[in-house]
Interface confidence: low
């Protein structure tokens, strides 16, 4: 039959060339003379001339050595024609398979591979993968099958078999426990790739395994006990710097310290922060400490890291004994602002109140007193007892110094400490009204016509407070009632002045006595200008000129 089985040809053949491979033969050669030819890549198209055929015998010829890694298979067509050139057979497919020889070594894809793994990981943890390639065939032969191995490990601590490599995949894994970055931060592995599945040619490369830091070391206080001295009342005062050591990677979260006050800070007086460079714990006062309340605080501080521990570690604690130092504290008036009710106008020398301060310090310090601000100069203060007395007339109606019935005084207390300290207090005297002002009419000058005069309404004011004010009473004195009448309205807060007899144009004094609800009397002279006119007038008209 006009067929040919696939032909296998080893690569790198020795020859001699041309080398006969197979014979094409058509059974039509019994009837007529047959001529054979081949076409296709490797015959009449690139790469031309690798194969040829003996025209008359049909022998397929190989003209030179083959390279499987260049072309692994050739597909040609065989033709048979008669002498007159007529085709006697359909074109026949000829497959030539190039079989592999182990003519290539493995090649790693990199000279140096880098990988990393956390310290302290369990055996079996994958680190990295390395890859080597081999151009030879790995499907039908072992020529291109690469097997990986570790040739050497440096350093050999804690022993020389810390890693293994999967012979087929090139995956490097941890095989032993004991990876400790603090002891060995990096391993250098010399790795091999060998073809023929480990029995052939070998090539080498380097795998560098970086051991990454894990938080497997707790920060430790050094020292663990501290004594500190802090003045009382100081806020934001640096009490103590706590020092820790940590074997983990500096400036990493596994190294950076986190401090926590675990006990002893009952009143939330302290705070602790981490210094960004030194990693020290800076203990400071959040609130002022009080020597008199508690002169010693014992704090327990725990240190951990920003990163969580990767295994259960005993944490370090420090004990800080904080001694509070006594400071001479200022006397404090009790209360800081004292309200006292006192009648206005009390006699000079009369006691107003006693206003004293307490000294927070435990020693029996002597406190002396004086007035710091007394705008009207109405008061004096005994330096020893804090007794406040009147030395001037307290006047509730004095608008310059009294606001809303209150006279404000500032007093000072000074202790005899070294150096002495002072405290101030505010004394608010609420002045109780006394009926010391009579009613006063407004206005005190009027203009009125002597014919059909309009009644004059005068407002009554009294500086005192109720009940020392309205209702008011009015009375005319010194014969003013001959020509005038004075009547208080129903509300009792205005007086109506009326002219009851004719007076010639002139200016007159009207003597008006007003008294308040407490019968405090006040005499006022009203200047009345009487005009020659009718009804309402504001100023007297000029003299009448007839025509």
């Amino acid at each position: 039959d006009w067929v040919v089985a696939p032909i296998s040809v080893p690569e790198n053949g020795k020859g001699p060339f041309p080398q006969r491979l197979n014979q094409l033969k058509s059974n039509k050669d019994r009837d007529t003379k047959i001529f054979y030819s081949i076409t296709g890549p490797g015959a009449d198209s690139p790469p031309e001339g690798v194969f040829a055929v003996e025209k008359e015998t049909g022998w397929l010829l190989l003209n030179k050595p083959l390279d499987r890694e260049e072309i692994a298979k050739y597909e040609l067509f065989g033709h048979a024609v008669s002498e007159n050139g007529a085709s006697v057979e359909d074109p026949m497919n000829i497959s030539i398979i190039v079989t592999d020889q182990n003519d290539h070594k493995p090649k790693f894809t990199q000279d140096t591979f880098r990988g990393s793994v956390l310290e302290g990981v369990l055996p079996g943890t994958s680190v990295m993968q390395v890859t080597a390639t081999d151009e030879d065939d790995a499907i039908y032969t072992y020529n291109g099958v690469v097997a990986y191995s570790i040739h050497s490990q440096e350093p050999k601590d804690p022993h020389d078999l810390m890693f293994t490599i999967h012979r087929s995949t090139g995956t490097i894994s941890v095989i032993s426990s004991g990876l400790d970055r603090e002891k060995v931060p990096e391993y250098t592995l010399t790795i091999q790739a060998t073809d023929m599945d480990g029995d052939g040619s070998t090539t080498t490369a380097v795998a560098v395994v970086e051991i990454l830091d894990a938080n497997d070391n707790a920060p430790m206080f050094d020292p663990q006990k501290y004594e500190a001295h802090v003045p009382e009342n100081a806020v934001g005062h640096e009490v103590q710097r706590l020092t820790v050591t940590d074997l983990d990677a500096p400036n990493s979260p596994a190294w950076r310290a986190t401090y926590l006050i675990m006990g002893g800070d009952d009143g939330d007086h302290f705070t602790i922060t981490t210094h960004p460079e030194s990693n020290q714990g800076i203990l400071t006062t959040r609130k002022g400490l009080d020597f008199e309340a508690k002169n010693q605080h014992t704090l327990y501080v725990e240190v951990t890291n920003e990163a969580p521990f990767v295994l259960k570690l005993p944490t370090s604690t420090a004990t800080i004994v904080v001694h509070v130092e006594d400071v001479n504290e200022a006397p404090v008036f009790v209360p800081p602002s004292k309200v006292v009710e006192v009648q206005e106008g009390i006699p000079t020398g009369e006691p107003v109140c006693v206003y004293t301060a307490e000294d927070p310090d435990k020693e029996n310090q002597k406190i002396s007193y004086r007035i710091l601000r007394d705008p009207a100069g109405w008061l004096a203060m005994d330096p020893d007892s804090g007794q406040v007395t009147a030395v001037g007339t307290l006047d509730r109606e004095d608008e310059q110094f009294v606001r809303n019935n209150i006279y404000e005084v500032m007093v000072l207390a000074m202790d005899n400490g070294s150096p002495p300290t002072t405290g101030t207090g505010t004394l608010l005297l609420t002045l109780i009204d006394v009926n010391d002002h009579g009613p006063v009419p407004e206005p005190r000058q009027i203009t009125i016509c002597n014919q059909s005069p309009v009644r004059q309404v005068l407002n009554i004011t009294d500086k005192d407070l109720s009940p020392h004010t309205s209702p008011f009473q009015a009375q005319l004195t010194d014969d003013s009632d001959i020509y005038w009448t004075a009547e208080v309205n129903e509300e009792g807060d205005t007086v109506v002045l009326s002219l009851k007899k004719f007076l010639k144009q002139d200016t007159y004094d009207v003597h008006l006595s007003l008294s308040d609800h407490g019968n405090k009397e006040q005499l006022t002279v009203i200047r009345a200008t009487v005009c020659d006119c009718h009804g309402h007038v504001e100023t007297c008209p000029g003299p009448w000129k007839g025509g």
Partner: antibody, heavy 123, light 113 residues
Framework: QVQLQESGPGLVKPSETLSLTCTVS????????INWIRQPPGKGLEWIGV???????NYNPSLKSRVTISVDTSKNQFSLKLSSVTAADTAVYYC?????????????????WGQGTLVTVSS | DIVMTQSPASLAVSLGERATINCKSS????????????LAWYQQKPGQPPKLLIY???TRESGVPDRFSGSGSGTDFTLTISSLQAEDVAVYYC?????????FGQGTKLEIK
């Protein structure tokens, strides 16, 4: 099996001192912090204080002036003393073990509790 | 002191239904150095001491049925009972152990509808 058992007088007179003990079995007494908690009848839980494994204590500020927690390792017992009691101190008192984050540390959820003992303050 | 606020004060849920209890703290209970939330949940039945259900906000205590779960971080936490059983009727408390004094929520009474 870890067990805690509170004991003490069920009736205390006003102004006197309430004294309770907590006996621990099944675990080393110095291994974990011990808390005291109380619960007035029909009400919620109030933490009284803790004693750490090293013997240090921390108390609730609301009771601090009146409370003392101590340990007697020879008897495997913890004690609670609350002075100047009033009717407001009537409650079931529990002792409970903290799970412990670290060995010295009193912080932690309370995983083992005693059955509690009712203390009534009345004359 | 850290104030713990539970809601609701009482809750009635049908058997087999989901029950959810909330707990809010007045400050964060997340501790930066170990990324743990210092919160526990307890169950208390009448005449008995409280029983620890959940710690570290979401870790179930050994022997606690898996229908109980805890979630949340910082200041907001939740206890969930996925399918209520008759034996779950109790008062539930949250508790912070982030800082002294330890404080509890006021409790949530869970009943069957």
């Amino acid at each position: 099996q870890v067990q805690l058992q509170e004991s003490g007088p069920g009736l205390v007179k006003p102004s006197e001192t309430l004294s309770l003990t907590c006996t621990v079995s099944g675990v080393s007494i110095t291994s974990y912090p011990i808390n005291w908690i109380r619960q007035p009848p029909g009400k919620g839980l109030e933490w009284i204080g803790v004693i750490w494994t090293g013997g240090g204590t921390n108390y609730n500020p609301s009771l601090k002036s009146r409370v003392t927690i101590s340990v007697d390792t020879s008897k495997n017992q913890f004690s609670l003393k609350l002075s100047s009691v009033t009717a407001a101190d009537t409650a079931v008192y529990y002792c409970a073990r903290s799970r412990g984050v670290y060995d010295f540390d009193g912080r932690g959820a309370m995983d083992y509790w005693g059955q509690g003992t009712l203390v009534t303050v009345s004359s | 002191d850290i104030v713990m606020t539970q809601s609701p004060a009482s809750l009635a849920v049908s058997l087999g239904e989901r029950a959810t209890i909330n707990c809010k703290s007045s400050q964060s209970l997340l501790y930066s150095s170990n990324q743990k939330n210092y919160l526990a949940w307890y169950q208390q039945k009448p005449g008995q001491p409280p029983k620890l259900l959940i710690y570290w906000a979401s870790t179930r205590e050994s022997g606690v049925p898996d229908r109980f779960s805890g979630s949340g971080s910082g200041t907001d936490f939740t206890l969930t009972i996925s399918s209520l059983q008759a034996e779950d009727v109790a008062v539930y408390y949250c508790q912070q152990y982030y800082s002294y004094p330890y404080t509890f929520g006021q409790g949530t009474k869970l009943e069957i509808k």
